[in-house]
Interface confidence: medium
């Protein structure tokens, strides 16, 4: 995201009342059917080229429709701000016939204290401002409307939340004479789910709350706390899920100890102990009673909150997430790496993969990547055989069914796939690795080998030569 | 394109009522707040209120309350305000607009003018 | 109930020259604003939206500036066609106030 290059002040508008009937307008379709790829897996792209057709068949009756843009709505109640007072908001493209919304939170790091909040405002003012919105945005990934590129969810109610209150959607202060900036993520996004129910939400039946990095974080904080908000305000019918990517980090040692003094340096327990203070952040309830008061920054740590949450939450996180390595002081700078730091990087992988034994709805390949669900590619990295829409597939069809008292795993539909070979980028879906002075695509071998990695201890547990284990991964097998 | 198509002038009697209409098209009608401001000859512009066409929500200026009902009939697209108990203070242009999101009214419809006199 | 001054009420000026209004809130409105022109006999128009931000179609000779409690609508290069009189609107909480209007004369 981009961040890594990087109350309520007086009575306003109250909430859409609930709606005594949820039946759409005159003249709309109750429900378009989901597509379930499951019968034309072995012959997807000759489905996907009847879809296409159909679609481009359609255009003329509803060119409206197959726009992709999202467009901007701020918010009407002002009072709800990014961190400088301006409002914050939304962007929405409705699918008229679904009754699946999908709310993506935005990510981009965060800032604790006056000093960094001054250097984001001066460098990142997107991040903690509307003032420069644009009025549309493309959906991609997750968030297209195209069944190519999203053979998951194409056809929901997409709304993406742009990110500019810097407290991982945790915040709820208000702006005033002592607070420099707001910190609301967590009333932006209630007041964006109040202001949603009168636009069709209210007719929902499944709410995805998604996220990515500081956004994944935000999912793990406040997916209960929106089901408990649609339940008190009358729609205890819709099924509110959690999609976090990118956002379930570890509390771990770093790899060299640097001071608390900026965002990227700063250990995230420090970090987020400082956070919680300045941005008045608030955690779901039943992980703050696990822990004393001024603990309550375990609560920003997946594999500590995600054992307290009612709603089923689908966890994307990349074996070697290129956020958590910048925090614990890992900066792969181009230089062949040190055993110690391969070490390191090894060991980081085998915690998080045991953090996530325990999830039964995860997706974890082994790449050094950060963020998977809105890039137009994220169809393409597979763990086990298995891609993300179709894991995300499966996991649909998993709740689904098990309304039904159906516990086992669907034969042929896995949705714990976790990778266990042990270092970056063994799993040769993963995306392209770049030089990052020339920019160059490294093929797998050439970044194990500038990894330092000695080929000879790669291949043995494999039972392989180091030389057919070259030429494996050289063809991308 | 979108267009908001207000009712003919109107000339009542002091103590009465008026019902005037705003008929919107060119948008999905239930999607955007419909606002009303009032117009007195030769003077500056004042917000009545809004209406949410998507669920009949509406909110009004405490001056306008008891005077100004706002209501919608999504089925015809059309946004209606009864003004009741007139006196020559009502006589004014009443517009219509379209609250576009985006801190805004973005489309007004042409005005209606009401004239109260005995 | 928040107050919008705007000033000058009125200003004479000739095709060419440039103008700026200014909009005052009584209290921080951040960047809750709107501005409009508007011609005898006819319905206002939304020339700038989120204080700064110009609406589809409108020349580019029109900015507007600001935020907080200061507000300032510019016009370079004045055109017969901008005569008419113009009002800025808040929308931090309701009612949602107009200033008195400035009403922009040819010389």
């Known amino acids: 995201s981009e961040g890594r290059k990087t109350w309520r002040r007086r009575g306003q508008q109250p909430p859409p009342p609930p709606r005594t009937e949820a039946a759409p307008a005159a003249g709309q379709p109750v429900e378009s059917f989901p597509l379930d790829f499951t019968a034309v897996e072995g012959n997807m792209d000759s489905f996907m080229a009847q879809v296409k057709s159909l679609a481009q068949s359609l255009y003329p009756c509803s060119a409206q429709q197959l726009n992709e843009d999202l467009r901007l709505h701020l918010l009407l109640n002002t009072s709800v701000t990014c961190n400088d007072g301006s409002p914050a908001g939304y962007y929405l493209k409705e699918s008229r016939g679904s009754r699946r919304w999908l709310l993506f939170l935005e990510g981009g790091w965060y800032c604790f204290n006056r000093e960094n909040c001054d250097s984001r405002y001066d460098t990142m003012r997107r991040l903690m401002s509307s003032r420069d919105w644009p009025r549309t945005r493309t959906g991609t990934g997750i968030l297209s409307s195209q069944p190519e590129e999203n053979p998951y969810w194409w056809n929901a109610n997409m709304v993406f939340i742009p990110y500019c209150s810097s407290d991982v959607w945790s915040g709820a202060s208000s702006k005033s004479e002592k607070n420099e900036y707001a910190f609301m993520g967590a009333l932006i996004i209630q007041e964006v789910v109040r202001e949603l129910l009168g636009r069709g939400l209210s007719g929902a039946k499944v709410l995805l709350l998604a996220g990515s990095s500081a956004g994944g974080t935000g999912v793990l904080l406040n997916v209960d706390r929106v089901a408990e908000q649609l339940e008190k305000l009358g729609y205890p019918a819709i099924q509110v899920r959690g999609l976090a990517d990118s956002g379930w980090f570890l509390d771990n040692k770093q790899y060299r100890h640097t001071d608390c003094v900026d965002t990227i340096t700063c250990a995230p327990t420090e970090a987020i102990r400082r956070g919680i203070r300045y941005w008045n952040g608030v955690v779901p309830e039943r992980c703050r009673r696990q822990f004393q008061e001024g603990e309550e920054w375990n609560c920003f740590f997946g594999y500590k909150v995600y054992p307290t949450l009612r709603c089923p939450v689908f966890v994307v996180q990349w074996l070697f997430d290129e956020a958590q390595l910048t925090v614990d002081n890992v900066h792969l700078t181009g230089q062949p790496v040190q055993e110690g730091l391969r070490l390191y990087i090894q060991n980081l992988g085998r915690e998080l993969r045991h953090t996530l034994k325990d999830v039964p709805a995860s997706f974890a390949p082994a790449c050094l990547s950060h963020e998977i669900i809105i890039r137009s590619h994220w169809t393409d990295v597979q763990v086990k055989g298995t891609s993300l829409p179709r894991a995300l597939h499966c996991w649909d069809r998993s709740l689904h069914d098990s309304h039904k008292a159906s516990k086992t795993p669907l034969k042929g539909c896995p949705v714990h796939l976790v990778d266990s070979c042990p270092w970056p980028h063994c799993n040769p879906s993963c995306p392209t690795v770049r030089d990052q002075f020339t920019g160059q695509e490294m093929n797998v071998a050439q970044f194990l080998m500038h990894m330092g990695f000695d080929m000879q201890t790669v291949a043995q547990p494999q039972g392989l030569e180091p030389s057919e284990l070259l030429g494996m991964l050289s063809n991308g097998s | 394109q979108i267009q908001l198509q207000q009712s003919g002038p109107e000339l009542v009697k002091p103590g009465a009522s008026v019902k005037i209409s705003c008929k919107a098209s060119?948008?999905?009608?239930?999607?955007?707040?419909i606002n009303w401001v009032k117009q007195k000859p030769g003077q500056g512009l004042e917000w009545i209120g809004w209406?949410?066409?998507?669920?009949?929500?509406?909110k009004y200026n405490e001056k306008f309350k008891g005077t100004a009902t706002l209501t919608v009939d999504t089925s015809s697209s059309t946004a209606y305000m009864q003004l009741s108990s007139l006196t020559s203070e009502d006589t004014a242009v009443y517009f219509c607009?379209?609250?576009?999101?985006?801190?805004?009214?973005?489309?007004w419809g042409q005005g209606t003018s009401v004239t109260v006199s005995s | 109930d928040i107050q919008m001054t705007q000033s000058p009420a009125s200003l004479s000026v000739s095709v060419g020259e440039t103008v700026t209004i200014t909009c005052r809130a009584s209290?921080?409105?951040?960047?809750?604003l709107a501005w409009y022109q508007q011609k005898q006999g006819k319905s206002p128009r939304l020339l700038v939206y989120?204080?700064?931000n110009l609406a589809d179609g409108v020349p580019s000779r029109f900015s507007g500036s600001g935020s907080g409690t200061q507000f300032s609508l510019k016009i370079n290069s004045l055109q017969s066609e901008d005569f008419g009189t113009y009002y800025c609107?808040?929308?931090?909480?309701?009612?949602?106030?107009f200033g008195g209007g400035t009403k922009l004369e040819i010389k």
């Open positions: 607009a379209r609250y576009g999101n985006l801190l805004d009214l973005d489309y």
């Open positions: 060119g948008y999905r009608f239930t999607d955007y707040y």
């Open positions: 209406i949410y066409p998507g669920n009949g929500n509406t």
């Open positions: 209290e921080n409105i951040y960047i809750n």
């Open positions: 989120a204080a700064t």
């Open positions: 609107q808040h929308f931090w909480g309701t009612p949602y106030t």
